[in-house]
Interface confidence: low
C-alpha cells in the first residue's frame, strides 16, 4: 500500500463515501507504519487543515457536513528532512452523501445473473444530476463515476458490470451529484443486490404432497442437496421476491429447507438455489424447475404465510 519513494499512502475507513453526519477515519501510511501526519485539503497542499494539527495513526473526521467533501492529501513525519515532512500523499476524494434526493437503481436484464454474464446497472433520477456514482457495499475504493445522460427531465447513467464473478456479487447503491459540487452526493438509492448463480451444484426441489394438488390443500416445497448449503432460496416465476430459509442437516446427510406455501390457490413454476453464509450473494445452479398445478377453483394469488424478502437484503446474512 505504500506510495512512491517518499510518498505516504492516504486511505479512508470504512469508505470514501460518507453519509452526512457520519464519521470517517483517515489513515496516513508512511514508511512501513502509521506515523505522525498532517492533512491537506483540495489544492491548498501547502496549508495543513485543522490548524496544522498533527495526527497519529488515524484521524476520525466527523460528523461530516457537505463542506468536508473534497480531495485530501497527507504528509508523513520525516524528522531528518529539511521540512520535517514527506512529499504529499496520493489524493483521496471524500464524498459526502445525503445532499439531494435519492436516485433509483435498476438491473438489466435483472439482478439474478449467471457467472460470466454482464449486467447493466442503470441509475436514474428526475433530479438534474450531472454525475452518477456506483458503489458496492464493503468496498473502500472510490465508487465508479459516469456522466449523466439526457437533460433535466430524467438523468441516467448505465454502469456495465461484468463478466460477473463472485467478487462482483453484492449490494450496490448509486448516488448523483449536481454541477459545481461533484463530491456532494445525493442520498443513496435503495440497495440493489446483484446475485451470481451457477457456481455450485444444483439442489433438488420437490413438492409435498405432490406437484398436482387440490385447491385449498396445503403445499410444502422442499429444497435439498448433498452440498452443505447454509441457505436455500426459493423463487417463483414472475415474482420479484424470493423466499429464503436456513438449511437443516438431515439424517440422510442431505441439507434441506422446507418452504410451506399454505393452501394452494394458484400454481406456478418454482426453482430453488443454495448458497453459503460466507458468500450470501453467490448462489448455486438453479434446481430443475418444478411446476405446481392446482386443480379446482383458484381464487386469488398464493398467500404468503411468511413475508417474502424484500428487493434487497438477499446479500445480508440470515441471523
Amino acid at each position: 500500500l505504500m506510495g512512491g519513494q517518499d510518498k505516504p499512502f492516504l486511505s479512508a475507513r470504512p469508505s470514501t463515501v460518507v453519509p452526512r453526519g457520519g464519521h470517517v477515519a483517515l489513515q496516513c501510511h508512511y514508511r512501513r507504519g502509521f506515523n505522525n501526519f498532517m492533512l491537506y485539503k483540495e489544492d491548498r497542499s501547502h496549508v495543513p487543515i485543522f490548524h496544522g494539527r498533527i495526527f497519529q495513526e488515524s484521524f476520525i473526521m466527523g460528523p461530516v457536513t457537505p463542506a468536508h467533501a473534497g480531495t485530501y492529501r497527507c504528509r508523513g513525519s520525516r524528522p531528518h528532512s529539511l521540512t520535517g515532512w514527506s512529499a504529499p500523499s496520493n489524493p483521496l476524494v471524500i464524498m459526502v452523501t445525503g445532499n439531494h434526493r435519492k436516485p433509483s437503481l435498476l438491473a438489466h436484464p435483472g439482478p439474478l445473473l449467471k457467472s460470466g454474464e454482464t449486467v447493466i446497472l442503470q441509475c436514474w433520477s428526475d433530479v438534474a444530476f450531472e454525475h452518477f456514482f456506483l458503489h458496492r457495499e464493503g468496498i473502500s475504493e472510490d465508487p465508479s463515476r459516469l456522466v449523466g445522460q439526457a437533460h433535466d427531465g430524467v438523468s441516467k447513467a448505465n454502469f456495465s458490470i461484468g463478466p460477473l464473478m463472485p467478487v462482483l456479487a453484492g449490494t450496490y447503491r448509486c448516488y448523483g451529484s449536481v454541477p459545481h459540487s461533484p463530491y456532494q452526493l445525493s442520498a443513496p438509492s435503495d440497495p440493489l443486490d446483484i446475485v451470481i448463480t451457477g457456481l455450485y451444484e444444483k439442489p433438488s426441489l420437490s413438492a409435498q404432497p405432490g406437484p398436482t394438488v387440490q385447491a385449498g390443500e396445503n403445499v410444502t416445497l422442499s429444497c435439498s442437496s448433498w452440498s452443505s448449503y447454509d441457505i436455500y432460496h426459493l423463487s417463483r416465476e414472475g415474482e420479484a421476491h424470493e423466499r429464503r430459509l436456513r438449511a437443516v442437516p438431515k439424517v440422510n446427510r442431505t441439507f434441506q429447507a422446507d418452504f410451506p406455501l399454505g393452501p394452494a390457490t394458484h400454481g406456478g413454476t418454482y426453482r430453488c438455489f443454495g448458497s453459503f453464509r460466507a458468500l450470501p450473494c453467490v448462489w448455486s445452479n438453479s434446481s430443475d424447475p418444478l411446476l405446481v398445478s392446482v386443480t379446482g377453483n383458484p381464487s386469488s394469488s398464493w398467500p404468503s404465510p411468511t413475508e417474502p424478502s424484500s428487493k434487497s437484503g438477499i446479500c445480508r446474512h440470515l441471523h
Epitope: 434526493r101 428526475d126 433530479v127 427531465g153
Partner: antibody, heavy 115, light 107 residues
C-alpha cells in the same frame, strides 16, 4: 395508497391571480418531483414544468415562464401552482402529477378566466 | 423540443377487437415513454411507463412496445370501459412533450 388531491374550481377575472394546491399522501413527498400539466378546453395535454420537492427548485417549460410559479409546503406534503395576471387563454384544467413518468395524477382543477 | 406524433387522431373499434395506437418521436428517446388514458371528468390514468411496463392495477389487455423513436400501445381485446382519449408522453428530455392524443370510440 398514493393520492393527489387538488383544490376546487376557480372563477377569476382577467388580471387576477389564482393559486391551486395539490396535496399528496401515501408516499414520501420529497422522493418524487411534482409535475404540472395543462389541458385547455377541447385541447390536448401540455406539460408546464416540474418542481424538485427535495430542493424546491422549479423548472418551467418555455410557454410557462414568467406568470407561472410552482411552490411547496413540504411539511404539509403540498405543491402549489400560482398563475399571475390571468388571461382568457389560461382557462383550462390544471393537473398535478408525481414522478418522472407522471405515475399518479390529481383530479384536476378547472380555472375559468372570464369577465 | 422533441415532437411526439400520435396516430390515428381518432378511431372507432368494435368490442373484442385488437386496437393499436402509435407514437413517433422526432428523435431517439430510448424507452422513456408513458401512455395515459383520459376520460371526461376523471383523473388521467397512467397505463404504461418505460415504453412497455404495465402500471400496477392496469388490466393485462393493455401492452406497450417500442424503443428509440417508434412506440405503440395495444389493447388486445377492446372493452367498453376502454373508450377515452389516449396520450403518449416522452420524458427523456426537458421539456416533456405529449402526443396530440387519440380518441377511441366504440363502434
Amino acid at each position: 395508497q398514493i393520492q393527489l388531491v387538488q383544490s376546487g374550481p376557480e372563477l377569476k377575472n382577467p388580471g387576477e391571480t389564482v393559486k391551486i394546491s395539490c396535496k399528496a399522501s401515501g408516499y414520501i413527498f420529497t422522493n418524487y418531483g411534482m409535475n404540472w400539466v395543462k389541458q385547455a378546453p377541447g385541447k390536448g395535454l401540455k406539460w408546464m414544468g416540474w418542481i424538485n420537492t427535495y430542493t424546491g427548485e422549479p423548472t418551467y417549460a418555455d410557454d410557462f415562464k414568467g406568470r407561472f410559479a410552482f411552490s411547496l409546503e413540504t411539511s404539509a406534503s403540498t405543491a402549489y401552482l400560482q398563475i399571475n395576471n390571468l388571461k382568457n387563454e389560461d382557462t383550462a384544467t390544471y393537473f398535478c402529477a408525481h414522478g418522472p413518468w407522471l405515475a399518479y395524477w390529481g383530479q384536476g382543477t378547472l380555472v375559468t378566466v372570464s369577465t | 423540443d422533441i415532437k411526439m406524433t400520435q396516430s390515428p387522431s381518432s378511431m372507432y373499434a368494435s368490442l373484442g377487437e385488437r386496437v393499436t395506437i402509435t407514437c413517433k418521436a422526432s428523435q431517439d428517446i430510448n424507452s422513456y415513454l408513458s401512455w395515459f388514458q383520459l376520460k371526461p371528468g376523471k383523473s388521467p390514468k397512467t397505463l404504461i411507463y418505460r415504453a412497455n411496463r404495465l402500471v400496477d392495477g392496469v388490466p393485462s389487455r393493455f401492452s406497450g412496445s417500442g424503443s428509440g423513436q417508434d412506440f405503440s400501445l395495444t389493447i388486445s381485446s377492446l372493452e367498453c370501459e376502454d373508450m377515452g382519449i389516449y396520450y403518449c408522453l416522452q420524458y427523456d428530455e426537458l421539456p416533456y412533450t405529449f402526443g396530440g392524443g387519440t380518441t377511441l370510440e366504440i363502434k
